[in-house]
């Protein structure tokens, strides 16, 4: 007996074959004997089957001999053994229907579970094997569960299921909610303008939800919520600012913060948080923001950053074309009686300069320039 | 009154290179994006290039991507575009455009234009 | 990418007469459509942004209307000022794109 397997919602053309390259009389038939389909003449006639809408034949292949089932919008329980009648013999055709979905919506955030569910015809025994967008392979029966997705399993997952040595392929595409970077970090100037952005790693026609900016600065005992926003249709309206700092919100994705200059008082940590319509949970992202001040009190020139740097950062003082002055893995380094030049200021990883500032030291008898 | 006033368009040979300036003046430069527009008889009017308030972020459409930057002073109320590997399809009138948002959004003034030929 | 297709190319209006000029996405774009008047020698002006609104200074013989992809300029009596380009701009998402234009000419 051949078995041919069929996807829920697709369509299946079971073939039968006459030894007689003409057209002859065929009958198609159920395994309880009712007909579904057969021939006239040159007519297609129907029978009572719970098929009739949607079983169909190709007249253009009776002349050949050929005289296959079509079943359009296949269901699970189409699953059953197909009989063609002709030439006084039969042919034989299991059809085992499956279908594949996710069991929640396609669209997930970041860090929850999907599961898939296979719906297969009572007797079968199928396996199914899940391959992710990143190359990952899951294995299982029934049901496949995946937990903690990430930004890489956002793609179309194609899953195979095994059946009587055949095979048929499902298609799933999963979006996974998520910014595209989990945390970023931005180095400024004290006075310069600082903007926070925070794309996100999916596109969708409408998006709906509501969102806030939770900051914690370096100097603070506590974080306070410095915006809250809500999105409506991709359009984004601020609903509360702080007075201090006031920011500025972008009314277009992706979503984007404007702090009118930085402030020692204002380095720290952030958390922006995005609160989808009709999703649990929400999306994160971190932002760090690290202010530098360079400055001269009498004798003595000074160059701090505040916020969120790491140990192996290097600070250092240095001349204008010269070599560094002091260079410390500290957040204030300072020089005694700097002679009259350009000083710079680096913050620098690994050699390479994250953040810049430059002071002018005049002769003693004048006062600094800031450039 | 605000106003936008282009300059650097040239006649190029293809695959050369060109900087276009865009000096700004009547309003608060650096609280605004900037965009660059170019027009042609055939395309009609098209997106090249946009720059944040702060200058931090910039978007591209795919066809400039790679090969035109845009950027910003705003110390001296400047835009800039560096065109790089010209081609004869670039060959337009640049429009320097302000948004009516801090990032972007549509364009609510635009400069009087200066002319690019790619040409050999 | 959100495409924009304005129609028509070109209209001959007599004076005092309604002029229509339609802009149909591909996407929906809620109610995110611009529209600008260019005349020659001249950039494009601003004359409608976003939600249907009208820009200060533009006379309210000038209006538009829809919401989703299909989207509707109007001059209710045709002036002889009014000969101009007239672009539409959907400005829901990046890449931001134009309509073709729409040549308008006194008949």
């Known amino acids: 007996k051949k078995v041919v397997l069929g996807k829920k919602g697709d369509t299946v053309e079971l073939t039968c074959t006459a030894s007689q390259k003409k057209s002859i009389q065929f009958h198609w038939k159920n395994s309880n004997q009712i007909k579904i389909l057969g021939n006239q003449g040159s007519f297609l006639t129907k029978g009572p089957s719970k098929l009739n809408d949607r079983a169909d034949s190709r007249r253009s292949l009776w002349d050949q001999g050929n005289f296959p089932l079509i079943i359009k919008n296949l269901k699970i329980e189409d699953s059953d053994t197909y009989i063609c009648e002709v030439e006084d013999q039969k042919e034989e055709v299991q059809l085992l229907v499956f279908g594949l979905t996710a069991n929640s919506d396609t669209h997930l955030l970041q860090g929850q579970s999907l599961t898939l569910t296979l719906e297969s015809p009572p007797g079968s025994s199928p396996s199914v094997q899940c391959r992710s967008p990143r190359g990952k392979n899951i294995q299982g029966g029934k049901t496949l569960s995946v937990s903690q997705l990430e930004l890489q399993d956002s793609g179309t997952w194609t899953c195979t299921v095994l059946q009587n040595q055949k095979k048929v392929e499902f298609k799933i595409d999963i979006v996974v909610l998520a910014f595209q970077k989990a945390s970023s970090i931005v180095y400024k100037k004290e006075g310069e303008q600082v903007e926070f952005s925070f794309p996100l790693a999916f596109t969708v026609e409408k998006l709906t939800g509501s969102g806030e900016l939770w900051w914690q600065a370096e100097r603070a005992s506590s974080s306070k919520s410095w915006i809250t926003f809500d999105l409506k249709n991709k359009e984004v309206s601020v609903k509360r600012v702080t007075q201090d700092p006031k920011l500025q919100m972008g009314k277009k994705l992706p979503l984007h913060l404007t702090l009118p200059q930085a402030l020692p008082q204002y380095a720290g940590s952030g958390n922006l948080t995005l609160a989808l319509e009709a999703k649990t949970g929400k999306l994160h992202q971190e932002v760090n923001l690290v202010v530098m001040r360079a400055t001269q009190l009498q004798k003595n020139l000074t160059c701090e950053v505040w916020g969120p740097t790491s140990p192996k950062l290097m600070l250092s003082l240095k001349l204008e074309n010269k070599e560094a002055k002091v260079s410390k893995r500290e957040k204030a380094v300072w020089v005694l009686n700097p002679e009259a030049g350009m000083w710079q200021c680096l913050l620098s990883d690994s050699g390479q300069v994250l953040l810049e500032s430059n002071i002018k030291v005049l002769p003693t008898w004048s006062t600094p320039v800031q450039p | 009154e605000v106003q936008l006033v282009e300059s650097g368009g040239d006649l190029v040979k293809p695959g050369g290179s060109l900087k276009l300036s865009c000096a700004a003046s009547g309003f608060t430069f650096s609280s605004y994006g900037m965009s660059w527009v170019r027009q042609t008889p055939d395309k009609g009017l098209e997106w090249v290039a946009t720059i944040s308030s702060g200058g931090s972020y910039t978007y591209y459409p795919d066809n400039v991507k790679g090969r035109f930057t845009i950027s910003r002073d705003n110390a001296k109320n400047t835009l800039y575009l560096q065109m790089s590997s010209l081609k004869s399809e670039d060959t337009a009138m640049y429009y320097c455009?302000?948004?009516?948002?801090?990032?972007?959004?549509?364009?609510?003034?635009w400069g009087q234009g200066t002319t690019l030929t790619v040409s050999s | 990418e959100t495409t924009v297709t304005q129609s028509p190319a070109s209209l001959s209006v007599a004076i005092g007469e309604k002029v229509t000029i339609r802009c149909i996405t591909s996407t929906d774009i809620d109610d995110d459509m611009n529209w600008y008047q260019q005349k020659p020698g001249e950039p494009p002006k601003f004359f409608i942004s976003?939600?249907?609104t009208l820009r200060p200074g533009v006379p309210s013989r000038f209006s538009s209307s829809g919401y989703g992809t299909d989207f509707v300029f109007t001059i209710e009596n045709m002036l002889s000022e009014d000969v101009a380009d007239y672009y539409c701009?959907?400005?829901?998402?990046?890449?931001?794109?134009f309509g073709s234009g729409t040549k308008l000419e006194i008949k």
């Open positions: 455009a302000r948004h009516e948002d801090g990032n972007w959004n549509y364009f609510d003034y």
């Open positions: 701009l959907q400005s829901d998402t990046l890449p931001l794109t």
């Open positions: 976003e939600g249907n």
